[in-house]
């Protein structure tokens, strides 16, 4: 503990200027005081001043009032500091002395004489209020007051409680009169070292290092740290707990990066095509006729449907097509003929019938042939007659199915596993291979099962020029060439503009 016993001298009266021994002072009693403070004694005895002692300079002559003085010599009130717990009781001896010597340091002068002394014994609590007293004897009177106060940073009824106000890392407080800590605004805890976080700051998710702050723990955000942060990789999602990725409407996948409404958000399908939110890329485009490509961005060739008739060649134009007709034909699709039945325009055994009083004609085609001049062989593969992945082939007036290993039959409808079933026709030799039976055929036969009789194919020698398509007719030596754009002639051998010098049927 630590405190100060303060004694305020107010007035000393010695009207006759007398000493304690009855003698008078010449020319007057030059008065100074000695104060001795010690522990409580029922009977005051000589001995050490256990609580402290102090002397004053000369304060006056005979009778005088003592003014308060805060510094230098003659300080009043007098200060008697102590460094222990104040016990609450004391003994005080105040002596008035006359000195013939130095005013400032009378203690050191020889020949000092006692004028009077008083002794006070009793209890005294620590406090700021002065206790006032007056002592008289036959010759003198002393008015004074005293108190005990605690030194700076010491508090309590015995000045035993140390409290030093601070505002740093170790605490933020002032001191109450009893020495207890009074936290500065925004701080709490035994030593006022815990900040009071922003009001509403989440107790678990948030913390603070200074008042009115709310710092979020990992995974939380917001003013009060009550809102989570989604996963690092999350793209179009939210969370209800940290690092979650709950997808926004229209998004899917672990990180909500798959667009479930790609069609709506991006409109990838072009040219009036239909978009579906499905498929490996999250969408599929269904094209309108005449368009193709992943996004239906590619226009199909307008010539793809072979609109030009009678050997006319087709050329694509921006939004249409144009037919270049061979000699003897005209019209948008070369559908009109300048020929008559006299020109024998019907191929493949077609019968010619006069029309419009002989100014035009119409061909009646035999089975398996079509076209305005019976020039096209009917494609019997259009109905996909071959089962089990068999490949359909047009062969003269009929068609055959080329079966995958392990299958046979006219339509590849029969499943075979080995040569035990004698799959090879016309005396073919069967070989049992890993992918199914293979037939080695005798002369005059071909096909996977030796089922095809080899006949002469008029198109086999490639009689058509300039990339024309060859069609065989009813007789083995008959063929028709379908010319590409820019060429005419029975073998498509003439560029447009040159007269043909050969008949149409070779």
């Amino acid at each position: 503990g630590s405190g100060i016993f303060q004694l305020r001298l107010q007035e000393f009266v010695n009207q006759r200027g007398m000493l304690a021994n009855g003698q008078s002072c010449e020319p007057g009693c030059r008065t100074f005081f000695r104060i001795c403070l010690k522990h409580f004694q029922a009977t005051f005895s000589e001995g050490p001043c256990t609580f402290g002692n102090v002397s004053t300079p000369v304060l006056g002559t005979n009778s005088f009032v003592v003014r308060d003085k805060n510094s230098g010599s003659g300080r009043n009130p007098l200060q008697l500091p102590f460094n222990f717990t104040w016990p609450g009781t004391f003994s005080l001896n105040i002596q008035a002395w006359h000195t013939p010597g130095d005013d400032l340091r009378p203690e050191t002068s020889p020949g000092n004489s006692l004028i009077s002394q008083i002794i006070i014994q009793g209890s005294l609590a620590v406090g700021k209020i002065w206790r006032t007293d007056e002592q008289n004897d036959t010759l003198t009177r002393l008015s004074y007051s005293y108190r005990v106060i605690c030194s700076d940073n010491y508090y309590g009824e015995s000045c035993s409680r140390l409290c030093k106000k601070r505002d740093d890392h170790f605490g933020h407080y002032e001191c109450q009169p009893d020495g207890s800590l009074s936290c500065l605004p925004g701080w709490t805890g035994k030593y006022c070292d815990q900040p009071i976080c922003l009001s509403g700051c989440h107790e678990q998710n948030g913390y603070c290092s200074k008042p009115d702050e709310c710092i979020c723990r990992p995974g939380w955000q917001g003013r009060l740290c009550n809102e989570c942060i989604p996963h690092n990789g999350c793209r179009h999602g939210t969370c209800s707990i940290p690092w979650q990725c709950a997808c926004d409407e229209g998004w899917g996948g672990l990180f909500c990066d798959q667009d479930l409404n790609y069609c709506t958000h991006h409109s990838p399908c072009k040219n009036g095509s239909t978009c579906s939110n499905s498929g490996p890329k999250g969408y599929t485009c269904t094209c309108l006729p005449g368009y193709t490509g992943e996004h239906c961005e590619l226009g199909l060739s307008k010539c793809a449907s072979n609109p030009c008739r009678n050997g006319g060649s087709c050329k694509d134009q921006e939004n249409s097509y144009h037919c270049l007709c061979p000699p003897g034909y005209y019209g948008q699709h070369c559908e009109h003929s300048t020929l008559t039945c006299a020109d024998s325009p019907c191929f493949n055994g077609g019968s010619c019938r006069e029309r419009n009083q002989g100014s035009s004609y119409a061909c009646e085609c035999p089975p398996n042939f079509t076209g305005s001049n019976c020039e096209k062989k009917v494609d019997r593969c259009t109905s996909n007659p071959c089962a089990n992945g068999g490949q359909c082939q047009n062969r003269g007036p009929s068609r055959t199915c080329r079966c995958r290993p392990g299958f046979t039959g006219t339509h590849c409808e029969l499943h075979i596993s080995d040569c035990a079933r004698s799959p090879c026709a016309h005396g073919g030799t069967c070989h049992d291979l890993e992918n199914g039976p293979v037939c080695t055929c005798p002369a005059g036969f071909s096909g996977r099962r030796c089922e095809v009789r080899i006949t002469h194919d008029a198109c086999a020698s490639g009689p058509c020029f300039n990339g024309a398509t060859c069609y065989t007719g009813l007789s083995p030596n008959n063929f028709v060439c379908n010319c590409p754009y820019g060429f005419v002639g029975s073998r498509c051998e003439f560029p447009v503009g040159l007269p043909p010098s050969f008949p149409w049927v070779a």
């Epitope: 290092s209 990992p218 942060i229 179009h236």
Partner: antibody, heavy 118, light 107 residues
Framework: EVQLVESGGGLVQPGGSLRLSCAAS????????MAWVRQAPGKGLEWVAT????????YYRDSVKGRFTISRDNAKNSLYLQMNSLRAEDTAVYYC???????????WGQGTLVTVSS | EIVMTQSPATLSVSPGERATLSCRAS??????LAWYQQKPGQSPRLLIF???NLADGVPARFSGSGSGTESTLTISSLQSEDFAVYFC?????????FGQGTKLEIK
């Protein structure tokens, strides 16, 4: 694909101001907290400021407090950094990044250079 | 604030070999640590978060480990594209702080 594109950098005198912008795409911007991180030439990375996704709460490193302001416009998918009273020590490449002060910075922009010099 | 110290400042390793980079925090960061890769003229790229979780699209040759104050980034078999500067970052305490970086160069 997540993309963050910064703009607004340039040369400015000490005491001057600049406003940086960051355009975000490829993710739902309003769902995520955002930040600015800077890198002085030839030096390491330094967090500058953060803004929450929900209520726009902001945090700043001590050296820029009172001078810099981070903000966002969720309708425009944009993040901003208003820089006032610029000092020479603010010279750096400023990166826009997705993240908070208490989470990793998952995505970064290409950066914009701010040079403070007289 | 927490101080992050990376070592070594420069590491020379041959392609195909193993590289080990270290990061130390001045106090416990409870696994709240990330690693970034930065190539010259480019922005940083997140490699690892929460000490040992691989970020999306990062090759499996990268791995992270550690606890408390010590963390390690390991690249099992170095590829030519792995030579860059690597930064660690703690996000456990406010403010977030980065290490000064380790430059990984070809030996």
């Amino acid at each position: 694909e997540v993309q963050l594109v910064e703009s607004g950098g340039g040369l400015v005198q000490p005491g001057g101001s600049l406003r940086l912008s960051c355009a975000a795409s490829g993710f739902t911007f309003s769902n995520f907290p955002m930040a600015w991180v800077r890198q002085a030439p030839g030096k390491g990375l330094e967090w500058v400021a953060t803004i929450s996704s929900s209520d726009g709460t902001t945090y700043y490193r001590d050296s820029v407090k009172g001078r810099f302001t981070i903000s966002r416009d969720n309708a425009k998918n944009s993040l901003y950094l208003q820089m006032n009273s610029l000092r020479a020590e603010d010279t750096a490449v400023y990166y826009c990044a997705r993240g908070y002060y208490n989470s990793p910075f998952a995505y970064w922009g290409q950066g914009t250079l701010v040079t403070v010099s007289s | 604030e927490i101080v992050m110290t990376q070592s070594p400042a420069t590491l020379s390793v041959s392609p195909g070999e193993r590289a080990t980079l270290s990061c130390r925090a001045s106090e416990d960061i409870y696994s709240n640590l990330a690693w970034y890769q930065q190539k010259p003229g480019q922005s940083p790229r997140l490699l690892i978060f929460d000490t040992n979780n691989l970020a999306d699209g990062v090759p499996a040759r990268f791995s992270g480990s550690g606890s408390g104050t010590e963390s390690t980034l390991t690249i099992s078999s170095l590829q030519s594209e792995d030579f860059a500067v690597y930064f660690c970052q703690q996000y456990n305490n406010y403010p977030p702080t980065f290490g000064q970086g380790t430059k990984l160069e070809i030996k």
